[in-house]
Amino acid sequence: MAVTACQGLGFVVSLIGIAGIIAATCMDQWSTQDLYNNPVTAVFNYQGLWRSCVRESSGFTECRGYFTLLGLPAMLQAVRALMIVGIVLGAIGLLVSIFALKCIRIGSMEDSAKANMTLTSGIMFIVSGLCAIAGVSVFANMLVTNFWMSTANMYTGMGGMVQTVQTRYTFGAALFVGWVAGGLTLIGGVMMCIACRGLAPEETNYKAVSYHASGHSVAYKPGGFKASTGFGSNTKNKKIYDGGARTEDEVQSYPSKHDYV
């Protein structure tokens, strides 16, 4: 019962986590204009992985997609890649874990197969979560570096009468969504791996031990105790699922690359 609960909870937590990773990847607010120096700005800038937006005080919002692929910073491309890998692994993990759930009966699937699938999906969730956390952290690091660079620029070359306002960017909501979602996916993966241990059948076969109490002599059959510890060859453990052999056609939908208001 505890195993089923752990597995089910792991699945739900991972599902929420992956939904969060997808949401974070699609969100436009990865970086938002720092309002420390001007808290009542009439023009507010924010940027995502796929486009940058400007929200005016008038209420109008204009978003522009990053049309170039080669012209984008390598770090941004790396973050995109990490997030997509995280989503793809998470999606495959979810698909695998659905079939691995103890509460779902599919044909005559044995517990050992479900255990393998649970472990596979758990590992996938862990890697997915790590990818998301890594992606968000790389972006955050990039923001911090750029923030201090632009801060340094703000206080140099101010000798002239005309001031040029340098727009600085700080952490956007998507970063926090990404961190939390990645953490949840990671936790869900760990729970799946824990559940896998409970699902794996401990096939300890005790052969009959006969005791004969005939008069004075007690006959004992030696060699009767044979424990299948799992280290030796186990003919009963048939491998019916190969985690690495599964391929999925992932259709990833991105925000529109067209400008719209």
Epitope: Q33, N38, V40, T41, A42, V43, N45, Y46, Q47, S52, C53, V54, E56, S57, S58, G59, F60, E62, R64, V162, Q163, T164, V165, T167
Partner: antibody, heavy 118, light 113 residues
Amino acid sequence: EVQLLESGGGLVQPGGSLRLSCAASEFTFSNYAMSWVRQAPGKRLEWVATISSGRSSTYYPDSVKGRFTISRDNAKNTLYLQMNSLRAEDTAVYYCAGLGRGNAMEYWGQGTLVTVSS
Amino acid sequence: DIVMTQSPDSLAVSLGERATINCKSSQSLLNSGNQKNYLTWYQQKPGQPPKLLIYWASTRESGVPDRFSGSGSGTDFTLTISSLQAEDVAVYYCQNAYSYPFTFGGGTKLEIK
């Protein structure tokens, strides 16, 4: 055709209060951020206040902050400007304006004259 | 606050001639996010409210004749009337629409020579 019609102007003594109204028609009032702009006789235009479309944000210059309050009633398509502690320098024609792209004041009313004098 | 300075204060131009009005801001009005300049031009005729001519420094408002054009970037901007018409006699104002408080230039009075 978009119409903005200001009302509520008049003569008021220094330290007194006045409430201006701006009735909007022929455009989706609730979608627009709105502003009040004033113009003293023979002087340049001066921005007085702005309110966002959803009423969540209001902005004022230091010259009127704490004395003037901008508000709106989207159900009635009406913009308001509550003016307290009026001074002689607040004497001007007050216009209401609807903000469009580029934060530009796209639609303007005909204005209402506010005279602060003893 | 951003200070807007217009020049000249008044301008007399012959009908059919080009009229040029300048506007200078104390800070850049260029927004890095969309590479647009948040400068607006208005026309005000005597006894009337102002009328929007140009926003984003160079985008003409719908219904505005194409003889009106705006140019410039950063801190220096220009409003040009390519061929002055009698109905163009008015006071022209530039406005900072980039940051609060919104500020207007002192105005340029355009007359016919």
